[in-house]
Amino acid sequence: KVFGRCELAAAMKRHGLDNYRGYSLGNWVCAAKFESNFNTQATNRNTDGSTDYGILQINSRWWCNDGRTPGSRNLCNIPCSALLSSDITASVNCAKKIVSDGNGMNAWVAWRNRCKGTDVQAWIRGCRL
């Protein structure tokens, strides 16, 4: 599923991401835009043999199990395929664990490079939330 901007903002808010660990909703929508272009089925392979999955491009070396990443930790205790569902519950729950891990949203390279320090509220402007 490819979410609309405001549709995703509303879904993320429903799942409790607004101001989760101090990150406003705009940060999460911005991250999803530049990680996956709002596509829940996005997958991207990394040079270390791991793969990033879903709307927030969660990595198989640390957070989920895709059955083929050497040394996978699976800290979210889920199959990576669950992160590709049109229901973003699994991605959100895992993202909450990631953002609580110490580096905050810096764990997402796209957020660090494209969203951090910008007007992220623009990503939810005009949305009925």
């Epitope: 089925q41 997958t43 392979r45 040079t47 043999g49 895709d66 059955g67 083929r68 990443t69 050497p70 199959p79 990576c80 395929s81 590709l84």
Partner: antibody, heavy 116, light 107 residues
Framework: QVQLQESGAEVMKPGASVKISCKAT????????IEWVKQRPGHGLEWIGE????????YYNEKFKGKATFTADTSSNTAYMQLSSLTSEDSAVYYC?????????WGQGTTLTVSS | DIELTQSPATLSVTPGDSVSLSCRAS??????LHWYQQKSHESPRLLIK???QRDSGIPSRFSGSGSGTDFTLSINSVETEDFGMYFC?????????FGGGTKLEIK
């Protein structure tokens, strides 16, 4: 137990297309990548590409882009590979395998013969 | 693409001999190297994963070693059922690649 059952041998004419199937049983089909491998005598094993049935995400070896197309039907736990514009170079045994980085589970192979 | 070079192409041995098969990668692949045995008209069978981890049900006479670019599959006291083709495969990057194979034949 995990099993991958491939469709039977095919004899095709040059220029035609063929669709090979791989039915998976014994595990959660949507969770694991299905990978396709070609074997020709004297050419060893070649990785064609992969599909994640749960999402339909696909990756292809550059060499096989335009030649192979992967699909999956999650209702029947079956992955498919279509090969188009067949030539004698496509005559080979084609295997599906479950993608665990390594390949523990393999199909029995589908022999494709392309001949006029 | 990572190229895997296996040597020798053919190895002629007598049952009871011990042998070593080599697989060399064109660049470092850490330990992401796997070994398969294939007999005529059969699918490949996983022997060793991640360079040295013998798969369940594989006899202890098979062992793997190496890291980086140089890998070895050793068979201690070859048995008649061991004859066939042996392939290595890397999972360090895409596309996945295989070695050209070593044929283990009876002398």
């Amino acid at each position: 137990q995990v099993q991958l059952q491939e469709s039977g041998a095919e004899v095709m004419k040059p220029g035609a297309s063929v669709k090979i199937s791989c039915k998976a049983t014994g595990y959660t089909f949507t969770t694991y990548w299905i990978e396709w491998v070609k074997q020709r005598p004297g050419h060893g094993l070649e990785w064609i590409g992969e599909i994640l049935p749960g999402s339909g995400s696909t990756y292809y070896n550059e060499k096989f882009k335009g030649k192979a197309t992967f699909t999956a039907d999650t209702s029947s736990n079956t992955a498919y590979m279509q090969l188009s514009s067949l030539t004698s170079e496509d005559s080979a045994v084609y295997y599906c395998a479950r993608g665990d980085g390594f390949y523990y589970y393999w199909g029995q192979g589908t022999t494709l013969t392309v001949s006029s | 693409d990572i190229e895997l070079t296996q040597s020798p192409a053919t190895l002629s041995v007598t049952p009871g001999d011990s042998v070593s098969l080599s697989c060399r990668a064109s660049q470092s692949i850490s330990n992401n190297l796997h070994w398969y045995q294939q007999k005529s008209h059969e699918s490949p069978r996983l022997l060793i994963k991640y360079a040295s981890q013998r798969d369940s049900g594989i006899p202890s006479r098979f062992s793997g070693s190496g890291s980086g670019t140089d890998f070895t599959l050793s068979i201690n006291s070859v048995e008649t059922e061991d004859f066939g083709m042996y392939f290595c495969q890397q999972s360090n990057s895409w596309p996945r690649t295989f070695g050209g194979g070593t044929k283990l034949e009876i002398k």
